[in-house]
């Protein structure tokens, strides 16, 4: 079941999925001046069996000005620098992607990929939040949102991360720890 909505936006924070549940789709979007190859996939799909998950289909982009198809290659370093996603690019890794059964890793970039990735998440997907540069977490604890099915409708849980400006004074006891910790995360609540 696809999640109806995008994960919540919260002030001064960005989110990232550390692994993608089977059923997740990633649109094959190309950067300006490029388009999907004819008969190319519309999206990549995370699929798998009990032991292994991977992305089906390959995204391929070609110049809008030519009819030649481009081959699937890893971008050069300068291309990778330019690329960003809807979620943050961050070294934060609260879970080992490879160790989660039924999940795919972040797909590698494809040549002339759009600067923003558009994912279609499924129920049970978890995303992690982190404060943007210049802000810090007001508390120590998990900072995540999970797509859940409740009353026959999908919804994302409310992230518990509050990001405060460095200049702001707050009653924060002790040193900050990384907020995207996998342990002690809010557990599932009863849905109807």
């Amino acid at each position: 079941e696809l999640c109806d909505d995008d994960p919540p936006e919260i002030p001064h924070a960005t989110f990232k999925a550390m692994a993608y549940k089977e059923g997740t789709m990633l649109n094959c979007e190309c950067k300006r001046g490029f388009r999907r190859i004819k008969s190319g996939s519309l999206y990549m799909l995370c699929t798998g069996n009990s032991s292994h998950s991977s992305w089906d289909n390959q995204c391929q982009c070609t110049s809008s000005a030519t009819r030649n198809t481009t081959k699937q290659v890893t971008p050069q370093p300068e291309e990778q620098k330019e690329r960003k996603t809807t979620e943050m690019q961050s070294p934060m890794q609260p879970v080992d992607q490879a160790s989660l059964p039924g999940h795919c890793r972040e797909p590698p970039p494809w040549e002339n990929e759009a600067t923003e990735r558009i994912y279609h998440f499924v129920v049970g997907q978890m995303v992690y939040y982190q404060c943007v540069q210049g802000y810090r977490a007001l508390h120590r604890g998990p900072a995540e949102s999970v797509c859940k099915m409740t009353h026959g409708k999908t919804r994302w849980t409310q992230p518990q991360l509050i990001c405060t400006g460095e200049m702001e004074t707050s009653q924060f006891p002790g040193e900050e720890k990384p907020q995207a910790s996998p342990e002690g995360r809010p557990e599932s609540e009863t849905s109807c």
Epitope: P8, E9, I10, P11, H12, Y135, L138, H139, R140, G141, P142, Q158, Q160, I162, C163, T164, E168, S170, Q171, F172, P173, G174, G184, R185, P186, E187, E189, T190
Partner: antibody
Framework: QVQLVQSGAEVKKPGESLKISCKGS????????IAWVRQMPGKGLEWMGI????????RYSPSFQGQVTISADKSINTAYLQWSSLRASDTAMYYC?????????WGQGTLVTVSS | DIVMTQSPSTLSASVGDRVTLTCRAS??????LAWYQQKPGKAPKLLIY???TLESGVPSRFSGSGSGTEFTLTISSLQPDDFATYYC?????????FGGGTKVEIK
């Protein structure tokens, strides 16, 4: 299911101290912010402040900073709102709610009456 | 500080009416807005968050729209259970601000 249960109504005299409580159940209390909201008789809602029981991080509305103290004891899944010296103007209904941004779950409210 | 202004303060309507409540922010607040319903002697109940996302279990006759400074809560067909006071609420990383409320009463 998620529940927030507040302590009972209180009648106090001006100058007295008071501590009211909000006990959470049905979820991991330590991992969710709890806010306190005031509603004076016949008036609207006012956000007072918020606490993260996991580490007792707090944030107060400027209007209530120094007037009240928000605390929590995660070992018994309870958040508190306290006054060291009550005034007649503190007469109101006080709600706790689970946040931090919007409030999906609310306590039933604690009516505090301060009168000489 | 951001000020949230609700209008009208009181609205008289009949069962079956389409009702629109307005909430204005003194400066842009993106979509960081929630709506609540409160009945006398009861705690508020969350209806809408993120300006337009319906909370689980809330009837689909309720809908929210708007972004920036102007927001609306619409009840497509007013039911007897809907006569109550409605509050908008802005949230950000350092405070929460409620509007003054709109009371929806029976005409």
């Amino acid at each position: 299911q998620v529940q927030l249960v507040q302590s009972g109504a209180e009648v106090k005299k001006p100058g007295e101290s008071l501590k009211i409580s909000c006990k959470g159940s049905g979820y991991s209390f330590s991992n969710y912010w709890i806010a306190w909201v005031r509603q004076m008789p016949g008036k609207g809602l006012e956000w007072m402040g918020i606490i993260y029981p996991g580490d007792s991080a707090t944030r107060y509305s400027p209007s209530f900073q120094g007037q009240v103290t928000i605390s929590a004891d995660k070992s018994i899944n309870t958040a508190y709102l306290q006054w060291s010296s009550l005034r007649a103007s503190d007469t109101a209904m006080y709600y706790c709610a689970r946040g931090p941004y919007y409030f999906e779950y609310w306590g039933q409210g604690t009516l505090v009456t301060v009168s000489s | 500080d951001i000020v949230m202004t609700q209008s009208p303060s009181t609205l008289s309507a009949s069962v079956g009416d389409r009702v629109t409540l307005t909430c204005r922010a003194s400066q842009s607040i993106s979509s960081y807005l929630a709506w609540y319903q409160q009945k006398p002697g009861k705690a508020p109940k969350l209806l809408i968050y993120k300006a337009s996302t319906l909370e689980s279990g809330v009837p689909s006759r309720f809908s929210g729209s708007g972004s920036g400074t102007e927001f609306t809560l619409t009840i497509s067909s007013l039911q007897p259970d809907d006569f109550a006071t409605y509050y908008c609420q802005h949230y950000n990383s350092y405070s929460v601000t409620f509007g003054g409320g709109t009371k929806v009463e029976i005409k």
